[in-house]
């Protein structure tokens, strides 16, 4: 069919709950596509119609909610003016009552499920709510082995709960809780995750270093695309997390819908003292509003940032 | 919960510099998130001013950049406000406020600073 | 700067009517859009951030909507204690902006 794979994504997912998947990848679908779901190698495209249980709303293909029959593999087809790419979605249904028994057992959950609180310190952790703009989220319930986490240690700040001096007590199985509005009707999402506790300082203990950038400024044109790496030297046993922000936002949530600006794939080379880690940030095309604004590499307790600015008229030209 | 408390002159003579602490309990500072100053004058709207980072980076509004420093001192979990040069435009409620990936989700109750001679 | 234009500036409806406020943003904002509740003498409280997520504690009957340049926020059975001003901010790019503001009165 003249489609190009471009990969498989695995989800295993709770049944009885909305679920949603963005077809995403830039920078093909940041030009003119249109996007198609289908099941299963169908011919026939997931209906678009908003009442439909399983519909594709924009890029997304929604599941108000997800049943047992729905594992199986999804393809998302980006069809641009002279290509066509195609996305798998592997998902994997399973019955979960979060307060009956300990997702421990559960294969390959992925690392949204499973957090880390650092003992001693100020931490927080995530509820991760991936749905299109059409569903209106409510506010967030956080519970703590099935009971309502309240107290003032802790503070709901958006998708996040704030765990302030944290105890070895912290550890265990949490959720949250959101009620997801879409066309009237209203649906639960409840999200397990197993948390866990670390000794270790909050940034790994080490101070990892920042080869590069070196909080400088960039030339470079309107328009244009831009791959900047950011280059950490830190101890082999750290549990730094290395990241490109802006406006204290991870690039990929800032531009989160465009996707214009995306954080690539981290990679390290291993020394016998160190290790190199480089983690880049693209610029798909710069535009105005990137001029003039810190994008920052962060890594463990260290930050860098480069700032983009519009190269000085060439007057030899004139 | 997360808390503040702003602190600092209610009066401030024209062409002073303005000064304003937030004392955040709850949460450290340097864990995550930004941490704003956002004004109002007396009947008007809201403007942000600026704010410092968990990581001790600065942003400022163009408009104010260059009267406006916000430093932090971690031991006591505060950040503070200066702008100099300060005049009767400037006589506004003062609030600071934690943005979170989003929104500036908790606001301190605000502290009024009038600027006359 | 982005620019958010808010719309009305002022309404007065009577307790259980719906009352909807409009925000345009001088370019696309992207869904960086959040809804702030204030009451007279009291600091701002958020509502909504991202669009369409109600912050905590927030009732229901505030329901957002929108995207690109045009956002509503919606409540659809106005209550005595929802009588204060409402902003927009967008919260896309730096500086951060907010709207002028709809002082909402009961009628």
């Known amino acids: 069919d003249g489609c190009k794979d471009i990969f498989m994504k695995n989800e295993i997912l709770s049944a009885s709950q909305p679920f949603a998947f963005n077809c995403t990848f830039p920078p093909i679908t940041s030009g003119e596509v249109s996007v198609t779901w289908y099941k299963n190698s169908s011919k026939i495209p997931v209906s678009k119609i908003i009442q439909s249980r399983i519909h594709q709303d924009e890029t997304w293909i929604l599941f108000l909610p997800m049943e047992w029959g729905d594992s199986g593999v999804y393809q998302c087809v980006i069809k641009g003016r002279d290509s066509c790419h195609r996305i798998h979605v592997n998902l994997t249904v399973f019955e979960k009552h979060w307060c009956d028994t300990s997702i421990g057992g559960l294969p390959n959950l992925s690392d949204e499920y499973k957090q880390i609180l650092h003992l001693g310190k100020d931490d927080s952790l995530t509820c991760h709510l991936h749905f299109p703009k059409s569903c209106v989220l409510g506010p967030i319930k956080w519970y703590k082995d099935c009971n309502e986490i309240k107290g003032e240690r802790f503070t709901v700040l958006e998708t996040r709960l704030l765990v302030s001096n944290v105890s070895a007590e912290d550890r265990g199985n949490y959720a949250c809780q959101a009620i997801l509005t879409h066309s009237g009707k209203q649906y639960e999402v409840l999200n397990g995750i197993t948390v866990s506790i670390t000794e270790r300082a909050g940034y790994g203990g080490s101070v990892p270093k920042i080869i590069y950038p070196k909080n400088h400024s960039i030339e470079v044109q309107l328009g244009t695309t831009l791959i900047v790496d950011c280059n950490v030297t830190d101890t082999k046993d750290n549990t730094n997390l290395r990241c490109w922000r802006v406006n204290n936002t991870l690039v990929d949530d800032y531009y989160d819908e465009s996707k214009r600006i995306r954080e690539g794939v981290e990679t390290h080379v291993s020394f016998r003292e160190h290790n190199l880690y480089t983690v880049n940030i693209t610029f798909l095309e710069v535009k105005m509003e990137d001029y003039g604004l810190p994008f920052m590499c962060h890594a463990g307790v260290s930050t860098a940032y480069i700032i983009l600015q519009l190269p000085a008229p060439d007057f030899r030209a004139y | 919960d997360v808390q503040f408390q702003e602190s600092g002159p209610g009066l401030v003579k024209p062409s002073q510099t303005l000064s304003l602490t937030c004392t955040v309990t709850?949460?450290?500072?340097?864990?995550?998130?930004?941490w704003n100053w956002i004004r109002q004058p007396p009947g008007k709207g809201l403007e942000w001013i600026g704010y410092i980072s968990y990581s001790g980076d600065t942003n400022y509004n163009p408009s104010l950049k260059s009267r406006v420093t916000i430093t932090r001192d971690t031991s006591k979990n505060q950040f503070s406000l200066k702008l100099s040069s300060v005049t009767a435009a400037d006589t506004a409620t003062y609030f600071c406020?934690?943005?979170?990936?989003?929104?500036?989700?908790?606001w301190g109750q605000g502290t009024l600073v009038t600027v006359s001679s | 700067d982005i620019q958010m234009t808010q719309s009305p500036s002022s309404l007065s409806a009577s307790v259980g009517d719906r009352v909807t406020i409009t925000c345009r943003a001088s370019?696309?904002?992207?869904?960086?859009l959040n809804w702030y509740q204030q009451k007279p003498g009291k600091a701002p409280k958020l509502l909504i951030y991202?669009?369409?997520r109600l912050h905590s504690g927030v009732p229901s009957r505030f329901s957002p909507s929108g995207s690109g340049t045009d956002y509503t926020f919606t409540i659809s059975s106005l209550q005595p204690e929802d009588i204060a001003t409402y902003y927009c901010?967008?919260?896309?790019?730096?500086?951060?902006?907010f709207g002028g503001g709809t002082k909402v009165e009961i009628k």
């Open positions: 709850g949460y450290s500072i340097t864990s995550d998130f930004a």
């Open positions: 901010q967008q919260g896309h790019t730096l500086p951060w902006t």
């Open positions: 991202y669009t369409s």
């Open positions: 406020a934690i943005r979170g990936p989003y929104s500036f989700t908790y």
């Open positions: 370019q696309d904002i992207n869904n960086y």
